[in-house]
């Protein structure tokens, strides 16, 4: 990542400490998962990519942050509240729910580095975990005890 402008510590700095500082708390995505606001159809296609052929189809929504590497991440957004029938590809089956599958991805944030007396010394990359929704899966509803 050294091609990012001023991203690297000054000479003599310990890169293992300054460049990669762990934070184990996953950063939530910019927006929570929400019902689809755009009129893309709740149906399983017979061809096309996996996300449109799935019985829990989803679309991808861009999450861009220019102070993060990677700058572009894509979050899955379920197109249907329930699973789609394998037979018709269009009728929803209320016996199954369409739910997001999450993954904690390692990302790096660009942060100002500070010298011994609080002076600004370029930028450091801070390693974080970031929660990304990868796909929607068809699951049996939880039975509340």
């Amino acid at each position: 990542y050294s091609h990012w402008p001023s991203c690297c510590p000054s000479k003599g700095q310990d890169t293992s400490e300054e460049l990669l500082r762990w934070s184990t708390v996953p950063v939530p995505p910019l927006e929570p998962a929400r019902p689809n606001r755009h009129p893309e159809s709740c149906r399983a296609s017979e061809d096309g990519p996996l996300n449109s052929r799935a019985i829990s189809p989803w679309r991808y929504e861009l999450d861009r942050d220019l102070n993060r590497l990677p700058q572009d991440l894509y979050h899955a957004r379920c197109l249907c509240p329930h699973c789609v029938s394998l037979q018709t590809g269009s009728h929803m089956d209320p016996r199954g729910n369409s739910e997001l599958l999450y993954h904690n991805q390692t990302v790096f944030y660009r942060r100002p580095c500070h010298g011994e007396k609080g002076t600004h010394k370029g930028y450091c990359l801070e390693r974080r975990l970031y929660r990304v929704s990868l796909a929607c899966v068809c699951v049996r509803p939880r039975v509340m005890g």
Epitope: H3, P5, P49, E61, L66
Partner: antibody
């Protein structure tokens, strides 16, 4: 040579929908994000949204309140803009624009379609 | 959304003049700013990206500068073919937003 060719002018009634196409050639269609920008008569350029043709990922300008849908057909190297619930204020020229990206510093619309004039009138 | 404001809205200058257009962002956008040129009845064209980098094929009389909230587009020696409307655009945060444009005419 990179080219973006948009569909022809449209005249629509208020409440109707319009679908504009943008056929790309001269580059790898799935390798570049496609933006859609509107220009109402005498107004500033207004960004409507973008689509990544590789995975269909989108980002929309919420000012359009969910009336915009962006799709693509990778086999035809074509991006589509659909705008629903049209009103007279939607009259304007609609441009598709390819977005160049260097990986860390810039995102810039380097090639533009010729524009599609959409007129909304009763 | 980040608001972009250009000044002046229009200006008239003579061939050979040095012309300056400014663009102000409602919050800091680092150097994440592009400039576009739109000639009358034509499609917008990318002029400058990342505040100061000239797009390929753009004459060297065009230059850009600034950082944070205040940016400048300069034409060192105005030519007749520079008659156009110029727009700044931020890409620091989605949604992308444009300035209202500066219409440049020849005296």
């Amino acid at each position: 040579e990179v080219q973006l060719v948009e569909s022809g002018a449209e005249v629509k009634k208020p409440g109707a929908s319009v679908k504009v196409s943008c056929k790309a050639s001269g580059y790898s269609f799935t390798g570049y994000t496609m933006n859609w920008v509107r220009q109402a008569p005498g107004q500033r350029l207004e960004w409507m949204g973008l689509i990544n043709p590789y995975n269909g990922g989108t980002s929309y300008n919420q000012n359009f309140k969910g009336r915009v849908t962006l799709t693509r057909d990778t086999s035809a190297s074509t991006a589509y803009l659909e705008l629903n619930s049209l009103r007279s204020e939607d009259t304007g020229v609609y441009y598709c624009a390819r977005e160049d990206y260097d990986g860390y510093l810039y995102f810039a619309m380097d090639y533009w379609g010729q524009g599609t004039l959409v007129t909304v009138s009763s | 959304d980040i608001q972009m404001t250009q000044s002046p809205s229009s200006l008239s200058a003579s061939v050979g003049d040095r012309v300056t257009i400014t663009c102000s962002a409602s919050q800091g956008i680092s150097n994440y700013l592009n400039w576009y040129q739109q000639k009358p009845g034509k499609v917008p064209k990318l002029l400058i990206y990342y505040t100061s980098s000239l797009h390929s094929g753009v004459p060297s009389r065009f230059s850009g500068s600034g950082s944070g909230t205040d940016f400048t587009l300069t034409i060192s020696s105005l030519q007749p073919e520079d008659v156009a409307t110029y727009y700044c655009q931020q890409y620091s945060k989605l949604p992308y937003t444009f300035g209202q444009g500066t219409k440049l005419e020849i005296k």
